[in-house]
């Protein structure tokens, strides 16, 4: 029999680890898409929404050629930690209107935490430094109104979806370069 469940493997194939991270990211992307669609159905968005406290997009067509694994994993982990904080804030301060989405938001938070653990494991296996965020953490105050929390939810889910979408593409690309 192999090592007990949950024990770290002695040696590891980085491509297999990256594969596993891609699968988790894809799965979270699908969950986020579903929840964002649910949000749009329950609370139709009037135009676009943004939040100053959300991370700026790290990837685009222009950055794909110069992607490197350490930078991508570090930035992705920092950005996802920010989104995790925003999801936690939504669940805590979102108000009664968002309580109807509580089971889904809770599941999303759990999957986000799982992906973050996987990224941390991957970074430690690749002997990459576990960098702390270089931007100061902006404290998240309570939403100004019930409508404010709905707008924030649209912005958070939309931003997370976009970040994960690019993350899948970036990780797939990096896998071919390992």
């Amino acid at each position: 029999p192999g090592p007990p469940a949950g024990s770290p493997r002695v040696s590891s194939d980085p491509r297999a680890d990256l594969d596993s991270a891609v699968l988790l990211t894809r799965s979270l992307l699908a969950d986020t898409r579903q929840l964002a669609a649910q949000m749009r159905d329950k609370f139709p968005a009037d135009g676009d929404h943004s939040l100053d406290s959300l991370p700026t997009l790290a990837m685009s067509a222009g950055t794909l050629g110069s992607l490197q694994l350490p930078g991508v994993l570090t930035r992705l982990r920092v950005d996802l930690m920010s989104y995790l904080r925003h999801v936690q804030w939504l669940r805590r301060a979102g108000g009664p209107s968002l309580k109807t989405l509580e089971p889904e938001l809770g599941a999303l938070q759990a999957r986000l935490e799982r992906l973050l653990r996987r990224l941390q494991l991957l970074m430690s296996r690749l002997a990459l430094p576990q960098a702390a965020p270089d931007q100061p953490v902006i404290p998240l105050g309570p939403p100004a109104s019930a409508w404010g929390s709905i707008r924030a939810a649209h912005a958070i889910l939309g931003g997370l979806h976009l970040t994960l979408d690019w993350a899948v593409r970036g990780l797939l690309l990096l896998k071919t370069r390992l």
Epitope: D48, S50, S60, A61, G62, R169, L172
Partner: antibody
Framework: EVQLLESGGGLVQPGGSLRLSCAAS????????MNWLRQAPGKGLEWVGV????????FYADFVKGRFTISRDNSKNTLYLQMNSLRAEDTAVYYC??????????WGQGTLVTVSS | QSVLTQPPSASGTPGQRVTISCSGS????????VNWYQQLPGTAPKLLIY???LLPSGVPDRFSGSKSGTSASLAISGLRSEDEADYYC???????????FGGGTKLTVL
């Protein structure tokens, strides 16, 4: 609701120029890479090029390099395609499309460009 | 000549399951995500499948995608008359540094 609306198509002579526009609404335009694609009458889809969300990076298909230029104005939520030295084989419906990664998740309705003398 | 290869046509009767194939190489399908688009007659294309097998919101789960090696396929179960359309596969090509498409498959519901 995400909407993309192309305009500027029409009839132009070979060797002539045309500028297409794509007005975007319903999303944060400055967060998304944007593409132009085309479809010749009765033919398949063909990718023309992409511009990164902030506008500083552009990539083109080989058949348009040096002739077509993609640009964007994020303050106006508008994407552009400047087409020069047009040829008969550039006759097609031109679509703008949004990219959140590797795919085109929203497309405009298209604008027809006819290159003929 | 398209970089990705699709059969020009496919057909089926209502309720049937049909599959459309798309073959490429290691520089496109082998190393990159495959996306599928549906183009109904006289309309713009619409995203049907992304990242090999994910469905955008609003697309019925009768549609599914899969990928193996340098080939991909789109399956439509419980075929309906409104599925009659052109279907295109697409992927990024590392060698060409471009998005490439299949030539399209015209699906007829008999």
């Amino acid at each position: 609701e995400v909407q993309l609306l192309e305009s500027g198509g029409g009839l132009v002579q070979p060797g002539g120029s045309l500028r297409l526009s794509c007005a975007a609404s319903g999303f944060t335009f400055s967060h998304y890479d944007m593409n132009w694609l085309r479809q010749a009458p009765g033919k398949g889809l063909e990718w023309v090029g992409v511009i990164s969300y902030e506008g500083s990076n552009k990539f083109y298909a080989d058949f348009v390099k040096g002739r077509f230029t993609i640009s964007r104005d994020n303050s106006k939520n508008t994407l552009y395609l400047q087409m020069n030295s047009l040829r008969a084989e550039d006759t097609a419906v031109y679509y703008c499309a949004r990219t959140p990664g590797s795919h085109f998740d929203y497309w405009g309705q298209g604008t027809l460009v006819t290159v003929s003398s | 000549q398209s970089v990705l290869t699709q059969p020009p046509s496919a057909s089926g009767t209502p309720g049937q399951r049909v599959t459309i194939s798309c073959s490429g190489s290691s520089s496109n399908i082998g190393n990159n995500a495959v996306n599928w688009y549906q183009q109904l007659p006289g309309t713009a294309p619409k995203l049907l499948i992304y990242y090999d097998d994910l469905l955008p919101s609003g697309v019925p789960d009768r549609f599914s995608g899969s990928k193996s090696g340098t080939s991909a396929s789109l399956a439509i179960s419980g075929l309906r008359s409104e599925d009659e359309a052109d279907y295109y596969c697409s992927a990024w090509d590392d060698s060409l540094n471009a998005v490439v498409f299949g030539g399209g498959t015209k699906l007829t519901v008999l």
